[in-house]
């Protein structure tokens, strides 16, 4: 507010207080409460009384700056109030409130007694910003096939209330709610999506903005969507390759999933022939014989689901006249 000179002084003083309506400081920083008397060169400041103004109780003295006695800090503010470092102008009644805490937020006033101009006073509001410490909590495990599901929630508490938003390429919806406390507010934002495998590995970033932060705070969560693709078998594209004596024949089971799936091979009409080796998703055959003909089943599974795909292997024997006709007709 505009400093109010004392009426009824009967003096034509052009003096005024230079101050600030609002002083903003971040929690833990020192707050400078300004109160500088700008007057004529021959005027003197006798004392500056600083008080914290309570709307109901009255006022609590912080300190008294006296031209003769120096700085006197009231017991409640001992070790917390000092004058700005030298050099100091004798007309400067400003004080430093060290290590500002939330309880310091409120209204303050300085009352300046000058000679010969009389008294002046000004008041200001101290605002203590409490920067948030955001936390991100992933939602329940995401699985392809679910409907709209909570991917993550992000909570930040501060004073004033922080802003919580999401930065991501993933399609989804965000909703926020806020809880007011006596001196702060907690904001929680939730991000919901319909899980799909294309979201796997995509970043979901919580962005927290607050006047007490030099830059936005960002916490990134990498999306994991559980899924299991249909299985298929590769290796039988050219049946003519599956003939007796061929070496290095393999069947490869194709699938993908999150978490990565495990593979297993079985033979439908009996055990796997001797010499046939299972190596993860691949079934390796020794030199082919007609014994290797049969129905092979690839089993794919992860924590979410399991899939299977089967193929019929027919090993051709060029020596077998009955099969020669098939070969010719197949070509």
């Amino acid at each position: 507010g505009k400093p109010i000179p004392n009426p009824l002084l009967g003096l034509d003083s052009t003096g005024e207080l230079e101050t600030s309506d609002l002083v903003t400081v971040v929690l833990g920083q020192d707050a400078k409460l300004p109160c500088f008397y700008r007057g004529d060169p021959d005027e003197q400041v006798g004392q500056v009384a600083w008080a914290r103004v309570d709307p109901n109780e009255g006022t609590r003295e912080l300190a008294l700056l006296h031209s003769k006695y120096g700085l006197h800090v009231s017991p409640a503010y001992e070790d917390r109030v000092e004058q700005p470092p030298p050099p100091r102008d004798p007309l400067d009644g400003s004080i430093l409130l060290r290590n500002a805490v939330q309880a310091d937020e409120g209204e303050y006033e300085c009352r300046v007694s000058t000679f010969p101009a009389g008294s002046f006073q000004a008041r200001m509001r101290l605002r203590v910003l409490v920067p948030p410490l955001p936390s991100l909590n992933p939602g329940p495990p995401l699985e392809e096939g679910q409907g709209l599901t909570l991917a993550a929630s992000c909570t930040a508490e501060g004073s004033p209330a922080p802003s919580v938003t999401w930065d991501t390429e993933v399609k989804g919806t965000q909703s926020s709610r806020s809880f007011k406390h006596s001196r702060s507010a907690a904001v929680t934002s939730e991000f919901h999506l319909v899980p799909s495998r294309s979201m796997n590995g995509q970043p979901l970033t919580c962005v927290v903005s607050h006047p007490g932060l030099l830059q936005d705070q960002r916490i990134t969560h990498t999306l994991q969507v559980a899924f299991l693709a249909e299985a298929s078998v590769r290796g039988l594209e050219d049946q003519n390759l599956w003939h007796v004596g061929r070496e290095g024949a393999t069947l490869k089971c194709l699938s993908e999933g999150q978490p990565p799936p495990k593979y297993n091979w079985t033979r439908l009409d009996g055990p796997l022939p001797s010499g046939v080796r299972v190596k993860g998703d691949t079934l390796g055959f020794p030199p082919l014989t007609t014994e290797h003909s049969g129905v092979y089943v690839c089993h794919v599974s992860n924590e979410l689901s399991s899939r299977a795909s089967q193929v019929t292997v027919e090993v051709l024997d060029p020596e077998d006249p009955g099969k020669q006709v098939d070969l010719v007709s197949a070509s």
Epitope: L8, G58, P75, A76, R111, S113
Partner: antibody, heavy 120, light 111 residues
Framework: EVQLQQSGPELVKPGASVKISCKTS????????IHWVKQNHGKSLEWIGR????????IHNQNFMGKATLTVDKSSSTAYMELRSLTSEDSAVCYC?????????????WGQGTLVTVSA | DIVMTQSPTSLVVSLGQRATISCRAS??????????MHWYQQKPGQPPKLLIK???NLESGVPARFSGSGSGTDFTLNIHPVEEEDTATYYC?????????FGGGTKLEIK
């Protein structure tokens, strides 16, 4: 309950000194400034000065510079005022006082007063 | 120093009537929020007792028949209806700056 208990009446000769005490109880001594007030017989009240018990900082009324010395003893939660070079003008009741809980201004608690009589 | 001028110096009021005591400061003792003016009651042989702080705030335990008003330089203490126990001397005091000063006092008598 906040209490300020002052020492008893004093009869002293001109030129001498006297030290009166103000023992406090019912609150944390170092959290409130102690003020001293003089009242001449049948007259008004005059603020002598104040002392911060936490650090011993003192502010006097200029009229009492050199006349009144304010001290505290934190261990006994007691404030003292010594008056020196006494004259008959110094004959008065002296009070110690303290502000209330909600604010620093207005003296909500007073000692019962100590009568100082300066007479040959 | 701020000079506090009280009037009248003495006052006689009938039981049940209104007593009005005035106090003028030599300069304003008011901020937009509060006036740094307080009122005390003193009975013989006793220390002063705080009645009103900040011009109009009744101190805890003080009867509601006491009220204070005013701002700037002019302040008033009202007692209505007066009772016999209100016989005392009343003082105003400012706490705007050091030194704090008191008014000369108003002696109230009830008839």
């Amino acid at each position: 309950e906040v209490q300020l208990q002052q020492s008893g009446p004093e009869l002293v000769k001109p030129g001498a000194s006297v030290k009166i005490s103000c023992k406090t109880s019912g609150y944390t001594f170092t959290e409130y400034t102690i003020h001293w007030v003089k009242q001449n017989h049948g007259k008004s009240l005059e603020w002598i000065g104040r002392i911060n018990p936490k650090n011993g900082d003192i502010i006097h009324n200029q009229n009492f510079m050199g006349k009144a010395t304010l001290t505290v003893d934190k261990s006994s939660s007691t404030a003292y005022m010594e008056l020196r070079s006494l004259t008959s003008e110094d004959s008065a009741v002296c009070y110690c006082a303290r502000s209330g809980y909600g604010s620093s201004y207005g003296f909500a608690y007073w000692g019962q007063g100590t009568l100082v009589t300066v007479s040959a | 120093d701020i000079v506090m001028t009280q009037s009248p110096t003495s006052l006689v009021v009938s039981l049940g009537q209104r007593a009005t005591i005035s106090c003028r400061a030599s300069q304003s003792v008011t901020t937009p929020r509060y006036s740094y003016m307080h009122w005390y009651q003193q009975k013989p042989g006793q220390p002063p007792k705080l009645l009103i702080k900040y011009a109009s705030n009744l101190e805890s335990g003080v009867p509601a028949r006491f009220s204070g008003s005013g701002s700037g330089t002019d302040f008033t203490l009202n007692i209505h209806p007066v009772e016999e126990e209100d016989t005392a001397t009343y003082y105003c005091q400012h706490s705007w700056e050091i030194p704090y000063t008191f008014g000369g006092g108003t002696k109230l008598e009830i008839k």
